[in-house]
Interface confidence: low
């Protein structure tokens, strides 16, 4: 904590400007009015303050706003955001997407920090759901964001937001997350024609039930093995050999290389040997 000392004569700050970089920590504490700082936060980022000086500025804001900063200040925090703790951020009420973007920009290129994670948490909770603009923004900064959400949190994603999701955004999703996302994707893409629909729905198929896989098998989709290997085992097991052959098309030969891995292994064990032999791949049930 910086000691309370009187501001030397003539040093009282009238505005936030570059002259302040020459102030010692105690002078900043004594000579910069917290309310002035709050109203001129947008200037702080243009001034090359040291980390120690930024600590003092943060301390002043903390004293002025013990219950949490107002959004007008948060939006202009800039690099001062990196000084905030998750506990600080939990006091905030961030509702503007512009504020969120401004702070994510500060952290751009870095791994998602607990601070950023908490900020996003507060923002999404404040909005009540993950709308398309928010999802667009978050996945642009953090492609893995969607797969960081619990199934319950994903349930608040409206189907319209699914249009913002790219295949790479789902790379780290687990089956329970895809279980929630798949019905939303199905709804979002329902008016597309067969081949276009498959391109869009493919990344979400880890949440598809058996009946949907059966329906896809009738549409000459030629699913690749990588997608097939991500399907739910319980959804694949009831498929017949003929259905799997139609589903995979020319990729059916890849089953041989995957015969020891789930879901292929379990599916093979469910089939009659005569049916497997029709594939001509030497699969043993």
């Amino acid at each position: 904590e910086v000691e309370k000392t009187a501001c030397p004569s003539g040093k009282k700050a009238r505005e936030i400007d570059e002259s302040l970089i020459f102030y010692k920590k105690w002078e900043l504490e004594a000579c910069v009015d917290a309310a002035l700082l709050a109203t001129q936060m947008d200037r702080v980022n243009a001034i090359p303050f040291t980390y120690e000086q930024l600590d003092v500025l943060k301390h002043k804001l903390d004293e002025l706003y013990p219950q949490g900063y107002p959004e007008s200040v948060i939006q202009h925090l800039g690099y001062l955001f990196l000084k905030m703790s998750p506990e600080d951020i939990r006091k905030w009420n961030v509702t503007s997407l512009e504020t969120l973007k401004a702070l994510l920009e500060v952290n751009k290129g870095h791994e998602m920090s607990p601070q950023v994670a908490t900020l996003i948490d507060r923002f999404v909770k404040g909005r009540g759901q993950l709308d398309k603009d928010t999802l667009d923004t978050l996945t642009a900064f953090y492609p893995g964001y969607l797969c960081s959400l619990s199934p319950e949190e994903l349930s608040s994603v409206p189907p319209s937001s699914i249009w913002a999701v790219r295949p790479q955004d789902l790379d780290t999703c687990d089956p329970r997350q895809l279980d929630v996302l798949y019905p939303k994707a199905r709804l979002a893409f329902q008016n597309m024609n067969g081949s276009e629909y498959f391109v869009k729905i493919q990344s979400f198929l880890g949440g598809a039930p058996t009946e949907d896989l059966k329906a896809l098998s009738q549409q000459n989709v030629s699913m690749d093995l990588a997608t097939f290997m991500k399907l739910r085992t319980d959804a694949v097991l009831p498929l017949t050999v003929a259905e799997v052959q139609k589903l995979l098309g020319p990729h059916v030969e890849g089953l041989k290389a995957e015969e020891r891995h789930r879901p292929v292994r379990d599916w093979i064990l469910r089939q009659r040997q005569d049916d497997l032999d029709t594939l001509g791949l030497g699969l043993q049930g």
């Epitope: 998750p86 506990e87 939990r90 791994e111 998602m112 920090s113 607990p114 994670a117 908490t118 996003i120 948490d121 893995g144 797969c147 960081s148 959400l149 619990s150 199934p151 319950e152 949190e153 780290t172 329970r176």
Partner: nanobody
Framework: QVQLQESGGGLVQAGGSLRLSCEAS????????KAWFRQAPGKEREFVAS????????AYADSVKGRFTVSRTYAKNTVYLQMNSLKPEDTAVYYC?????????????????WGQGTQVTVSS
């Protein structure tokens, strides 16, 4: 309701390693195990490590950084704490905690469910 069951504690010599596990059962779609805290005799419970839903975001107490690693699996709703280079001051009862938010956090108030704890004793 969520039930948390810790295991893997025990007696180990200084410099040794242990791996704690915490398995969750019950309403785990909403609440999932994501943090470890510890409490030494006569001291307050303190934060050790936390992990986010996706498994890539983590947070650690300064005292364990570089020695402890938190990780989790999806299918079994299990969170792990790999403890290496153990010191006598790591001796404590280790508790697993489950919460609903997806960000890792050191704030014990963010966790709704707690395990019974597993004893870790590091002898010199």
């Amino acid at each position: 309701q969520v039930q948390l069951q810790e295991s893997g504690g025990g007696l180990v010599q200084a410099g040794g390693s242990l791996r704690l596990s915490c398995e969750a059962s019950g309403h785990t779609d909403s609440y999932y195990p994501k943090a470890w805290f510890r409490q030494a005799p006569g001291k307050e419970r303190e934060f050790v490590a936390s992990i986010g839903w996706g498994g890539r975001m983590t947070a650690y107490a300064d005292s364990v950084k570089g020695r402890f690693t938190v990780s989790r699996t999806y299918a079994k709703n299990t969170v792990y704490l790999q403890m290496n280079s153990l010191k006598p001051e790591d001796t404590a009862v280790y508790y697993c905690a489950a919460g609903i938010g997806w960000a890792p956090t050191a704030d014990s108030g963010e966790y709704d469910y707690w395990g019974q704890g597993t004893q870790v004793t590091v002898s010199s």
